[in-house]
Amino acid sequence: EVEKTACPSGKKAREIDESLIFYKKWELEACVDAALLATQMDRVNAIPFTYEQLDVLKHKLDELYPQGYPESVIQHLGYLFLKMSPEDIRKWNVTSLETLKALLEVNKGHEMSPQVATLIDRFVKGRGQLDKDTLDTLTAFYPGYLCSLSPEELSSVPPSSIWAVRPQDLDTCDPRQLDVLYPKARLAFQNMNGSEYFVKIQSFLGGAPTEDLKALSQQNVSMDLATFMKLRTDAVLPLTVAEVQKLLGPHVEGLKAEERHRPVRDWILRQRQDDLDTLGLGLQGGIPNGYLVLDLSMQEALS
């Protein structure tokens, strides 16, 4: 906290410029008018102040705007944004995507800080939904952003926003999140032709149901093993050997290397060994020939 002292004669700042780096902290406090600072915040971002001097400038803004900064100031905070607490940021009303981008740029290359997380939360809540432009911006800065949202939060993502999603944005998503995103992606890409559709939908298939996988198996998609291994186990289990063979195409040979891992392991246990043998991969663990398979879940449904 800087002591309140009168500004020395002739030192009153008429504008925010480089000469202010030669002011002591108490002189900045006494000689820089907070309203002037607020209107010329963009200039602060061109002046090489020390961190201590910036603390004084922040203090002046805090005094001027105890209820929270206006967006005209927020947009030009630059480094000062990193000095804000989440409590400070909760007082803000940020509506402009340009403001959001400017602040995310300051933190670029760093992990998502509590300040950034709070800012994004305020921004998205203010907009009411995660629209395409916002999602585009957020995933450009933080590829893992989408997967940091809860399934409930993801439900507010409109299908049109899915076009902004890149495969790497979904790398850390769990099945519950993909369950929400997959139907949106299916809707977003529904008018694309077979091969183009598969390229776009591939990253979302961890949320696909059995019937959609069956449909894909009829389209010569040649799904790679990495994608297959991310499919829901419950969606893979009902697929026949012939369907999996069609789904994977030339990649079917990769099943051998994954036979001890889910979902391949569980799927093998559900297949007739005879059928598995037709693949010629030496997959073992299927239902021996001559055994009858009862689907107990179907039996329960009937009774």
Epitope: V44, N45, A46, I47, P48, F49, Y51, G78, Y79, E105
Partner: nanobody, 115 residues
């Protein structure tokens, strides 16, 4: 973001030193740089500044005519040439920078002694 100062040392009053400020892990080219100093028991004070292009420089009254700030963007370095050093110039010298979007960096300092 980290800046690294070098070139400090012990020098006789009236002597000269050239301090350097370089970036660690990024390039200084689009950063405006300020030089500051802090004498024992005193507040840090501004010494000089230079714009990112090098076209604009400023100096504290106490060093005008003796210190010169410059930059070599090919070497990604900013310099502070200090001539006619006085005992009162004894301090730890720091550089601070500001770049695009208000990104900032500051160094740990280099010590200058002119007893």
């Amino acid at each position: 973001l980290q800046l690294v100062e070098s070139g400090g040392g012990l020098v006789q009053p009236g002597g000269s030193l050239r301090l350097s400020c370089a970036a660690s892990g990024f390039t200084l080219d689009n950063y405006a740089i300020g030089w500051f100093r802090q004498a024992p028991g005193k507040e840090r004070e501004g010494v000089s500044s230079i714009s990112s292009s090098g076209g604009s420089t400023n100096y504290a009254d106490s060093v005008k005519g003796r210190f010169t700030v410059s930059r070599d963007n090919a070497k990604h370095t900013v310099y502070l040439q200090m001539n006619s050093l006085k005992p009162e110039d004894t301090a730890v010298y720091y550089c601070a920078g500001v770049g695009d979007y208000g990104r900032r960096a500051m160094g740990q300092g280099t010590s200058v002694t002119a007893p």
